[in-house]
Interface confidence: low
Amino acid sequence: AWELTILHTNDVHSRLEQTSEDSSKCVNASRCMGGVARLFTKVQQIRRAEPNVLLLDAGDQYQGTIWFTVYKGAEVAHFMNALRYDAMALGNHEFDNGVEGLIEPLLKEAKFPILSANIKAKGPLASQISGLYLPYKVLPVGDEVVGIVGYTSKETPFLSNPGTNLVFEDEITALQPEVDKLKTLNVNKIIALGHSGFEMDKLIAQKVRGVDVVVGGHSNTFLYTGNPPSKEVPAGKYPFIVTSDDGRKVPVVQAYAFGKYLGYLKIEFDERGNVISSHGNPILLNSSIPEDPSIKADINKWRIKLDNYSTQELGKTIVYLDGSSQSCRFRECNMGNLICDAMINNNLRHTDEMFWNHVSMCILNGGGIRSPIDERNNGTITWENLAAVLPFGGTFDLVQLKGSTLKKAFEHSVHRYGQSTGEFLQVGGIHVVYDLSRKPGDRVVKLDVLCTKCRVPSYDPLKMDEVYKVILPNFLANGGDGFQMIKDELLRHDSGDQDINVVSTYISKMKVIYPAVEGRIKFSTGSH
């Protein structure tokens, strides 16, 4: 028998520095977790102790903190090179800065193979990107070889900016011929490494003949056997075992997100490359693991530029940006309108001639807006200012909801109106009218939504049984502020870009902003 140790990360989302337990900014260092310096310590410890070790990443290193905003992927290549990753799969967020923003900082700089079998380049891009990413790579490990085949969510054109010259094929259809090719090369130990979410990971394990292990990402799935060491609740045991259509037991793993855990899977293969046994658990990278001093010193060196960046002017406002709780928790506020407009702008994807865009709606809990911005400081808006408005380090995500769920969400928005509670919704692409004289649960008297399948966008009444795409904070997608109906009834959820980054990019693009209160939210009775 031959034993392989697979160390894996996914959805690190720019958490190069250690973070607090909830993956936001580290405040009390003695209780902080993750970060590349700590990860390196643990990886090196395992490399020294065990003979056959692979360090893999299942995508979405890009996007999530000011590190990505400033360094644009150069930081990913640099520190992944320093940690000596063996392979990475492309995630949807790797395309956030377009194909050029993937090629230049990462694909050209990475010293490890970057993989995806279901992305096919066409047109002028085909020659430019040729060889910079691969469908698979055969890696020597000890005296053996292991094949790694990559895959990426086929939803990427709706989630990011891959442009028109990349085709995202069905994962299973694209993977099978690549695995077959590996078999003809006498590679009998094959890992599928990819970024399509836990459901697709399980399908790959079931359907793709010849795949021995699946290492996934995208859904931030936490798997654990035994008592979990932190706040994350396991979605199943680690590894999660899928019985393939040809009767094999295929381990499927994922390691939550944000570099908080290092996935640790030990696989035993027989001489024909069959999996005999698999066991392991994610390792919580808490403060009991010291940060490697040389990587930490490098992090500190790179940090300097971030501190300078956060005080640079992104753009100007010529109006007061009212982010006060007195406004945003009671009525339409122009800070809410600005943020929602930025959220929609960040999701402009012209992927179908029938639609002017794939999504037109935004909802945002008023309690998530934490500060106004005064225009009298020369109108200057900095990253620092935006960090005061959006201090929680969240993301703006894409969900699919039925109209009936949205109606419930808007009823919840005003079910206890008047108590300055955070669930009051700010909106974009929605016109809502409330009648507060009616009883809670029956206060939405008009709910019109901006069409997407139209050449001239206009507002139509919400249809209860129709499925709509909506951009919202991850906090709401996860049921925060009492929006349990969103969490329970959502039909699809894809994590998006860092909240501050979305707004800062929009402000930089617009240069001068002047958001108004314009009648998105109305009250049909009372003095509002």
Epitope: H78, K108, K305, Q312
Partner: antibody, heavy 119, light 106 residues
């Protein structure tokens, strides 16, 4: 296409201040991520990096020369300037400006300007 | 500061030969190394960045390798126009250059 051109006094005396100008075209220091650096090369010798300025006015200097150096820019005129205070004969060199790529390697260089410090 | 040592000051080769120029960093610089070619009377031109990536338009007879502290620029099938001085440069810390290796063609 990207071009850079250095200009300087040609000759100056020890203890004077050397002022150099780099005029460039084909890119803008308004663009996020852009930067321009200065490198010098004494005749028949190796290259020495002096200073660098980013699009956002962030400045970096060679620590061993920091007290002598001042880098600045005029974004609207596509120019970067370097001042070296209190020069001496060891500062005789060809001075190049170059566009800094990604981290700190240089793809585009000017033709260089020869500066001689002589009593 | 990080010292980049090019121990060979001069190298000699005939057309068609293969030559290797080496460079050693005084500390780990990962793969943050570039190689430049400077022909007599000209400014330097980048050949390789990130230790092994050929800059666009550079002939494929130039290849770079190495990581950590030891780096090599290899010129396969040397041509007469390769007569030049070759410099390595690290950019892991503030940039520093090697002292250069002059290639002469026999």
């Amino acid at each position: 296409q990207v071009t850079l051109k250095e200009s300087g006094p040609g000759i100056l005396k020890p203890s004077q201040t050397l002022s150099l100008t780099c005029s460039f075209s084909g890119f803008s220091l308004n663009t996020s991520g852009m930067g321009v650096g200065w490198i010098r090369q004494p005749s028949g010798k190796g290259l020495e990096w002096l200073a660098h300025i980013w699009w956002d006015d962030d400045k970096y200097y060679n620590p061993s020369l920091k007290s002598q150096l001042t880098i600045s820019k005029d974004t609207s005129r596509n120019q970067v300037f370097l001042r070296i205070a209190s020069v001496d004969t060891a500062d005789t060199a060809t001075y190049y400006c170059a566009r800094r790529e990604r981290w700190a390697w240089f793809a585009y260089w000017g033709q260089g300007t020869l500066v001689t410090v002589s009593a | 500061d990080i010292v980049m040592t090019q121990s060979q000051k001069f190298m000699s080769a005939s057309v068609g030969d293969r030559v290797s120029v080496t460079c050693k960093a005084s500390q780990n610089v990962f793969t943050n190394v570039a190689w430049y070619q400077q022909k007599p009377g000209q400014s330097p031109k980048v050949l390789i960045y990130s230790a092994s990536y050929r800059y666009s338009g550079v002939p494929d007879r130039f290849t770079g390798s190495g990581s950590g502290t030891d780096f090599t620029l290899t010129i396969n099938n040397v041509q007469s126009e390769d007569l030049a001085e070759y410099f390595c440069q690290q950019y892991n810390s503030y940039p520093t250059f090697g002292s250069g290796t002059k290639l002469e063609i026999k």
